[in-house]
């Protein structure tokens, strides 16, 4: 059998291999050692017994999409049946005090490969023997601790394969410089050690994408916006646009990146080298946001100009793949730069919202029969922008972290947007009050620290007699800018 017979459904073409040469990978036309690495078709009954205690699942992930020329990394993680794990020596053991269908196991090992390899004979002194080889016959690399690696992973894509010895998790990186753009398929087959041979335990496949467009994501956030994911924002408040470029292999690390914004509101083009930008829409409506990201990245050089025509001379017949018999252009010089572009487009809706909320007065409410611990305080609140439909107050400790009480209630406010919110405080002390006004699309917050004094009957009585004038002088109630600082920190990534 050949590798493509084992690893794929269909034999890939030489055309595919020639057009996608992966550095360090081998042609899947190579022979597969079926004696050492048996091949089982899907549905073969032997799969049922390929692992003690159930089936092993292989999970294949990648950091796709990959910008052509960058590295893409594939990770395979083995998920063992319940109560099983790999120990420091690479053996598979039962987790302590873990109960599965078979109950608690007396034998701590599922597979004790260490014992087997110490027991093993037939070695030639170098630690190399006829069974410490990959499916194509290449010997295992002797990294430190290689004997504790008991799984063989065979990766297969684009008519080529890559073999790796590993533990329950492996990663493989591939440079995409020679990979055809578009979606591609990676398939992985995993074998485990079994005496002097190997047994297949899992197969997995995943699609990855190679692109010549910079993968771009934009997060949009705005103070007072109720739901940042619905692409509806508020008029007259800055929106923060933060651009994230998906570049896990840091291919663009040394590139100058330009961001060209069109906000769709006739404010023209805005070009920046900063990945974060603020923009304020001053009109309601629907706007088309467009971003173009440009980066000068390492890329292929244009081919040299063709030589002047010359009389045709006999040319050698087609050599093996990779000998470039058909006038394949020169391999790109690594120093060439090419402009890469990424695009992002969104339609955003701008609506009225509550722009600002302020507590302009705090007043102690005199009670004819004062409670022993309870104080009522009125907060006089103003707002700008749209009219709120609900008010929430959160009363917490002076650090504004430990909530003691939270109340929300609907409100009916006139167009002047002036309302009084009454809240009860249990006992004297300093409190943090978060007061939020909300409507369908916005949520505006303000915070105040207030000090509630001790209540003695005399002072209460005296205040009552004074007719309630100037009572807020009793309180040391300074509005603080805590909410501004907090909000800024939250939204700038």
């Amino acid at each position: 059998k050949r590798f493509h017979d084992v690893l794929g459904n269909e034999r890939p073409s030489a055309y595919m291999r020639e057009h996608n040469q992966l550095n360090g990978w081998s042609s899947d036309e190579n022979d597969w050692n079926e004696k050492l690495y048996p091949v089982w078709k899907r549905g073969d009954m032997r799969w049922k017994n390929s692992w003690k205690g159930g089936r092993v699942q292989a999970v294949l992930t990648s950091d796709s999409p990959a910008l052509v020329g960058s590295n893409i990394t594939f990770v395979v993680n083995l998920v063992f049946p319940r109560c099983q794990k790999e120990d420091a020596n690479g053996n598979i053991v039962y987790e302590k005090n873990c109960r599965n269908e078979a109950g608690l196991s007396a034998d701590p090992y599922v597979y004790n490969w260490t014992a087997w390899s110490e027991d093993s004979d037939g070695e030639n002194g170098t630690g190399q023997s006829h069974h410490n080889v990959f499916p194509d016959g290449k010997p295992f690399p002797h990294h430190p601790g290689w004997r504790r690696w008991n799984f063989v992973y065979v990766f297969h894509t684009l008519g080529q394969y890559f073999q790796k010895l590993g533990r329950c998790s492996v990663r493989v990186s591939v440079n995409t410089a020679n990979v055809t753009l578009g979606p591609q398929l990676m398939e992985v087959t995993v074998y485990r050690r079994h005496g002097r041979a190997y047994v297949p335990i899992a197969q997995v496949k995943d699609v990855y994408v190679v692109t010549d467009q910079i993968p771009v994501f934009v997060t949009m956030s705005q103070k007072n916006d109720r739901n940042s994911s619905d692409e509806t924002f508020l008029k007259d408040l800055p929106i923060t646009f933060d651009v994230l470029i998906h570049d896990p292999s840091h291919f663009l690390n040394y590139s100058t990146i330009n961001y060209k914004w069109s906000f769709g509101d006739n404010t023209g083009l805005f070009v920046s080298i900063n990945h974060t930008v603020n923009h304020t829409y001053v009109l309601n409506g629907t706007f088309s946001l467009n971003l173009t990201v440009k980066a000068a990245a390492p890329g292929p050089c244009p081919p040299p100009p063709p030589p002047p025509p010359r009389p045709p001379k006999p040319t050698p017949s087609l050599g093996p793949a990779g000998d470039n018999p058909l006038g394949l252009s020169e391999i790109p010089d690594e120093n060439c730069q090419i402009n890469r572009y990424g695009h992002f487009q969104a339609t955003i809706t701008i609506v009225e919202g509550i722009l600002e909320v302020n507590i302009i007065q705090t007043t102690d409410v005199l009670m004819l029969v004062p409670g022993p611990d309870s104080s009522l305080i009125d907060f006089v609140v103003t707002c700008q922008g749209s009219i709120p439909t609900e008010v929430c107050t959160i009363i917490s400790d002076p650090t504004c972290e430990i909530t003691q009480n939270a109340v929300c209630s609907p409100v009916d406010v006139d167009e002047m947007c002036l309302l009084t919110v009454r809240r009860a405080f249990n006992g004297s002390g300093t409190y943090c009050v978060n007061l939020t006004l909300g409507d369908d699309t916005s949520l505006a917050l303000t915070s105040t620290l207030i000090s509630v004094p001790d209540r003695d009957p005399a002072s209460s009585l005296r205040m009552a007699n004074s007719g309630g004038g100037g009572l807020n002088d009793i309180f040391e109630a300074q509005k603080i800018e805590w909410h501004e600082h907090h909000h800024h920190h939250h939204h700038h990534h």
Partner: antibody, heavy 119, light 107 residues
Framework: QVQLVQSGAEVKKPGASVKVSCKAS????????MHWVRQAPGQGLEWMGE????????NYAQKFQGRVTMTVDKSTSTVYMELSSLRSEDTAVYYC????????????WGQGTLVTVSS | DIVMTQSPDSLAVSLGERATINCKTS??????LAWYQQKPGQPPKLLIY???YRYTGVPDRFSGSGSGTDFTLTISSLQAEDVAVYYC?????????FGGGTKVEIK
């Protein structure tokens, strides 16, 4: 939808050169190799070569090596095929055809350009 | 280079009857073989790729089979609009090659 639109018919004298264009639209131009196939009157199809619009790598059939040059203009999504030292047996309809990913079969073809070489 | 041999050169079949065209390659190209239909004054039209997969929009009377070096295009019930020249093409390796063509006519 995918479209490949070729330049018009040409009449050339022996020894001259001809440059045929193929303008692509309806897909990401740099993602697919473009091939050139020719067909002499009453004859079969003959593959001439291919070019990758992304990096301008080329593969030419041995028969045309040294006489054919394939180039790309990414700004206009156009591929060019230039054939030099023309002879009468180069009289043919020249087609551009787009391959599909990693597979060299052709679902999309240009309408063809007739090149006549005559003294 | 891979040599493609298509047979027969021409074929006359009654309407509604089966038409079979063969394509032989000088080396194993399996499954990288495509079939095209070409009518006068038009570019070729892809029918079958990778030996047996019918391309989008191609009527199911067209089918491909074969492996290794021997491949077949079958038109199960010939229609008037199927009169054309049919070509096989190996897409296994470059240089790509086409068969010489088979002209299908109505008997």
């Amino acid at each position: 939808q995918v479209q490949l639109v070729q330049s018009g018919a040409e009449v050339k004298k022996p020894g001259a050169s001809v440059k045929v264009s193929c303008k692509a639209s309806g897909y990401t131009f740099t993602s697919y190799w473009m091939h050139w196939v020719r067909q002499a009157p009453g004859q079969g199809l003959e593959w001439m070569g291919e070019i990758n619009p992304y990096d301008q790598r080329t593969n030419y059939a041995q028969k045309f090596q040294g006489r054919v040059t394939m180039t790309v203009d990414k700004s206009t999504s156009t591929v060019y095929m230039e054939l030099s030292s023309l002879r009468s047996e180069d009289t043919a309809v020249y087609y551009c055809a787009r391959s599909t990913g990693n597979y060299a079969w052709f679902a999309y073809w240009g309408q063809g350009t007739l090149v006549t070489v005559s003294s | 280079d891979i040599v493609m041999t298509q047979s027969p050169d021409s074929l006359a079949v009654s309407l509604g009857e089966r038409a079979t065209i063969n394509c032989k390659t000088s080396q194993d190209v399996s499954p990288s073989l495509a079939w095209y239909q070409q009518k006068p004054g038009q570019p070729p039209k892809l029918l079958i790729y990778s030996a047996r997969y019918r391309y989008t929009g191609v009527p199911d009377r067209f089918s491909g089979s074969g492996s290794g070096t021997d491949f077949t295009l079958t038109i199960s019930s010939l229609q008037a609009e199927d009169v054309a020249v049919y070509y096989c093409q190996q897409h296994y390796s470059i240089p790509l090659q086409f068969g010489g063509g088979t002209k299908v006519e109505i008997k």
